[in-house]
């Protein structure tokens, strides 16, 4: 997150981290039920660990943390690497969470966000647009949902109904390491960090997020059948 601020501890209890090896963060994720996470489909890896209830970027033990393995990764069937359409994936964890003040699921928004809606995006991604600086703790950033027209003007030929744009203040954006993390609007999960320009935080190049309102049925059906 570029030019965000430290999240309040436990204010994003649905925020997850996907880790390679013992503790190498590569993507964010969102807890949506006691045993299921959402993340971006482009975050798919054959082996990874899941960390919930953690505030710090460092692997130091925190009393609220819970660690899991992913036992099932189900990317949306419409996702095709390296494209960005349908960029979401369900992850089933090896066990259910212990519900606590640090670890809680978030409800997915059924209604699509409208222009001007204020939202919060969070993650442990890089805090500098062109090189890798990492935050000490989880970062939060207020962003504004942009009109479809403005979104399409920013990225001609790249935007479809499975995406929405948010942000657009120069110097404020999600960035590398934030993929798959939550965009929460009015207390409900509206999107996932998906893509944007490189470097991040460029003028008139907002972050692009997976438009989860388009996938509520697929998410529910997939969880129920697995």
């Amino acid at each position: 997150i570029v030019n965000g601020s430290d999240c309040q501890k436990d204010a994003q209890p649905w925020q997850g981290a996907l880790l390679l090896g013992p503790n190498k963060l590569y993507c964010g994720a969102v807890l949506i039920s006691p045993q299921w996470l959402l993340t971006a489909a482009h975050c798919r890896k054959p082996v990874f660990r899941i960390r919930l209830g953690h505030h710090s970027m460092s692997p130091v033990y925190e009393s609220g943390q819970q660690m899991f393995q992913g036992i099932k990764s189900i990317p949306h069937p419409g996702y095709s690497h390296p494209g960005h359409s349908n960029d979401l994936m369900l992850i089933k964890m090896n066990r259910k969470i212990r519900d606590s003040h640090s670890v809680k699921p978030v409800e997915i928004a059924c209604d699509c966000a409208t222009e001007g809606t204020r939202c919060m995006v969070s993650g442990w991604g890089t805090t500098s647009s062109s090189h890798n600086n990492f935050p000490k703790v989880l970062q939060c950033l207020n962003i504004t949902v942009l009109s479809e027209e403005r979104c399409k003007n920013s990225y001609p030929g790249q935007i479809d109904k499975t995406m929405f744009c948010a942000g657009d203040e120069e110097g404020r954006d999600s960035c590398q390491g934030d993929s798959g993390g939550p965009v929460v609007c009015n207390g409900k999960l509206q999107g996932l960090v998906s893509w944007g320009d490189f470097p991040c935080a460029q003028r008139n190049r907002p972050g692009v997020y997976t438009n989860l309102c388009e996938f509520v049925k697929w998410i529910k059906d997939t969880m129920n059948s697995n």
């Epitope: 590569y26 975050c43 494209g83 991604g125 790249q158 999600s174 960035c175 590398q176 320009d197 190049r205």
Partner: antibody, heavy 124, light 107 residues
Framework: QLQLQESGPGLVKPSETLSLTCTVS??????????WGWIRQPPGKGLEWIGS???????YYNPSLKSRVTISVDTSKNQFSLKLSSVTAADTAVYYC????????????????WGQGTTVTVSS | EIVLTQSPGTLSLSPGERATLSCRAS???????LAWYQQKPGQAPRLLIY???SRATGIPDRFSGSGSGTDFTLTISRLEPEDFAVYYC????????FGGGTKVEIK
């Protein structure tokens, strides 16, 4: 399959501007999943990254060359270009264009497609 | 800038032998941001490994990468005749830089 082809003058005079173009064929340059870069290799030496550009025109330059480098993109021609000003003999090299993939995960995918390179000599 | 130092400069081995190439960074680099390339004379570099350990498309499994922090290794388990070339490591953790290369030559 995607191919990259560098073109431009093979000889440039000192203090002038080196101009090269990379033409992308077999695919579109207008993809938000990729960036397009320039790398050079002086005779008998190693590789040096010059800079890169996204299809939307956002650039990222090597700090040591930044004051002399301009990279631009022309999506209508499926091309991107390099301009290096105030050249000296030290800029004599094989210049490569290449493609890299990016997203917002914390992961570097490397540069997976390269042009065959074009030799540029700086001499009066 | 992050300086990458490759060693040895030249490695003289026979086909069938194991090659171990080292890349050391002047400061810590996330392994997610390290790549290896192969270059043969008169050709462009070819991506072998990205994310320190993931093989690029079409790369045989005799090539493997490992390491973290400041020390990274490219291993070729059994050298084939076509593997004799120059190998470069590259970091993109900050402004991208390449190592000076290791030449793997036939003994």
């Amino acid at each position: 399959q995607l191919q990259l082809q560098e073109s431009g003058p093979g000889l440039v005079k000192p203090s002038e501007t080196l101009s090269l173009t990379c033409t992308v064929s077999g695919g579109s340059i207008s993809s938000s999943s990729y960036y397009w870069g320039w790398i050079r290799q002086p005779p008998g030496k190693g590789l040096e990254w010059i800079g890169s550009i996204s299809y939307s025109g956002s650039t990222y330059y090597n700090p040591s060359l930044k004051s002399r480098v301009t990279i631009s993109v022309d999506t209508s021609k499926n091309q991107f270009s390099l301009k290096l000003s105030s050249v000296t003999a030290a800029d004599t090299a094989v210049y490569y264009c290449a493609r890299g993939e990016y997203d917002r995960s914390y992961y570097y995918y490397g540069m997976d497609v390269w042009g065959q390179g074009t030799t540029v000599t700086v001499s009066s | 800038e992050i300086v990458l130092t490759q060693s040895p400069g030249t490695l003289s081995l026979s086909p069938g032998e194991r090659a171990t190439l080292s890349c050391r960074a002047s400061q810590s680099v996330s392994s997610s941001y390290l790549a290896w390339y192969q270059q043969k004379p008169g050709q462009a570099p070819r991506l072998l490994i990205y994310g320190a350990s993931s093989r690029a498309t079409g790369i045989p499994d005799r090539f493997s990468g490992s390491g973290s922090g400041t020390d990274f290794t490219l291993t070729i388990s059994r050298l084939e005749p076509e593997d004799f070339a120059v190998y470069y490591c590259q970091q993109a953790f900050s402004s991208p830089t390449f190592g000076g290369g290791t030449k793997v030559e036939i003994k």
